[in-house]
């Protein structure tokens, strides 16, 4: 007959207040005849948690049916865990005897400690928008977890980031801990649709990490490129000039036309389109009247994007004599 071994596989068991804790214990032999008991602590002051033989333990249930002869599983569940339940729990085999049962063998013990789940990570981006090729900082915070060991990772669109710094406070013993991490992210022009993810893994989460996200659309400003072009065809005595504002973000945009330095109110039409990368294109059409025989019309398309300094593009209108003739012919 194999010598009895008491197996308690977990050295440490982290539990949450109010939840049920399962303490595992298996034996390798049914001999000697006698009960298995659970204690918290060691020595004369140890506290009886469960006695297979007798007693009433309202918060304790057995995992297996101890009335089955071939049962070798003496694991127990303790319900409604409170901070008072922390300590080291021992599964102990006794040999039937008198006047008392005789302690035969003890398991190595399982330390039960209170674990607290981290709060959902909150990711905060920069206060102001930044243009591509620049670096922005994102912070991630999570609080209230225990024990102190925690893993935090940063991702940008699923790719793990390496440029970040993390602190867990306090450094000494505490009931609960907080983590704060700052990641530095280089912005790309296509990052409007990008996300940064802060992922927190903790023993209390049972392999299901918590994630916090931030959209780079909140942090990026993609400045527009401008192009002003004159349409080759004219409509009566008018020439159509187009200002194309390309690849900008966010949508906030003011466009004004100037003719020889004078701001004009007339804008024939405009369209806003969204690109696949989340940036926008804006096209504005301006009709220039060429009936008054001027040769030196300079048009300026000025764009103020997201409160930044205005950028402009100029176009010197080319009006041929033939066009002038056509226009005067067309005028009654």
């Amino acid at each position: 007959e194999e010598e009895l071994q008491m197996i308690q596989p977990e050295k440490l068991l982290l539990v949450t207040v109010g939840k049920t804790a399962t303490l595992h214990c298996t034996v390798t032999s049914l001999l000697p005849v006698g009960p298995v008991l659970w204690f918290r602590g060691v020595g004369p002051g140890r506290e009886l948690i469960y006695n297979q033989k007798e007693g009433h333990f309202p918060r304790v249930t057995t995992v297996s049916d101890l009335t089955k002869r071939n049962n070798m599983d003496f694991s127990i569940r303790i319900s409604s865990i409170t901070p008072a339940d922390v300590g080291t729990y021992y599964c102990v085999k006794f040999r039937k005897g008198s006047p008392e049962d005789v302690e035969f063998k003890s398991g190595p013990g399982t330390e039960m400690a209170l674990g607290a789940k981290p709060s959902a990570p909150v990711v905060l981006g920069p206060a102001a928008r930044t243009t591509p090729e620049h670096t922005v900082s994102f912070t991630c915070e999570s609080h209230g977890f225990s024990p102190r060991d925690i893993t935090l990772k940063w991702f940008k669109n699923g790719n793990e980031l390496s440029d970040f710094q993390t602190n867990v406070d306090p450094t000494g013993q505490s009931v609960a801990y907080s983590i704060r991490s700052t990641a530095r992210v280089v912005l790309d022009p296509w990052d409007v649709r990008s996300q940064v993810i802060c992922e927190v893994a903790h023993v209390t989460l049972q392999g299901d990490p918590l994630r916090g996200t931030a959209n780079l659309s909140e942090a990026i400003r993609v400045p527009p490129t401008l192009e002003v072009t004159q349409q080759p065809m004219r409509v009566g005595n008018q020439v159509n000039v187009t200002c194309q504002v390309r690849k900008f973000y966010p949508q906030s945009l003011q466009l004004t036309w100037s003719e020889n330095g004078n701001v004009c109110q007339r804008e024939t039409a405009s369209t806003l389109t969204e690109n696949k990368d989340g940036t926008y294109n804006w096209t504005s059409w301006f009709l220039v009247n060429i009936s008054d025989q001027r040769d030196d019309v300079v048009l300026t398309c000025q764009v103020k994007h997201d409160g930044q300094l205005a950028v402009s593009k100029r176009l010197a209108l080319e009006v041929t004599v033939h066009q002038k003739d056509q226009s005067s012919d067309a005028t009654p």
Epitope: E1, L30, L31, V33, G34, P35, V36, Q52, K53, E54, L66, T67, K68, R69, N70, N71, K96, G97, S98, P99, E100, D101
Partner: antibody, heavy 118, light 107 residues
Amino acid sequence: EVQLVESGGGLVQPGGSLRLSCAASGFTLSSYDMHWVRQAPGKGLEWVSAIGTAGDTYYTGSVKGRFTISRENAKNSLYLQMNSLRAADTAVYYCVRGGVWDDAFDIWGQGTMVTVSS
Amino acid sequence: DIQMTQSPSSLSASVGDRVTITCRASQGINNYAAWFQQKPGKAPKSLIYTASSLHSGVPSKFSGSGSGTDFTLTISSLQPEDFATYYCQQYVSYPYTFGQGTKLEIK
């Protein structure tokens, strides 16, 4: 259903031998401590013998050296070989199963009568 | 060997009565005391183990108590089917021994 059925009892002369059998059903006999208990006519209960799960055997003083307890796992059966029988051995013999962890008797057979008389 | 002494050896009672049978061990047996019920011509039936635990299917009118050397079996409200002979037993060490029995009769 968990059941124990004894057989093999009968009338035997003093000095004779008898082998009692106990067929177990509904459980694996080798996983339990098993016992024989007897009751002489009009008398109380007397524990006779036991066999542990490890094959260890125990006897009451009056039968030591004369009785042998054994089991056959393949047949899920318990036996009591009784030699050098005496009139004082006359009794109903019960096969009894010991409890799960403390060997408390839980299941009893219906008994088989052994009469030792000339 | 450990001696188990039961008292009384016989007891008359009426239906509905509460009765107590006692058993004393010649030395401490922890709480490895069991109680059995036997009716004439039948095999004994297991009632109680480890002094106070009821076997499966045993009605709660049966209760046991005690530890060390003194043990009791109580039947809270006698019914006609409870009139039988009751035995105590120690099973802490071999040879296991029984009390001489208490015959419970209808008054």
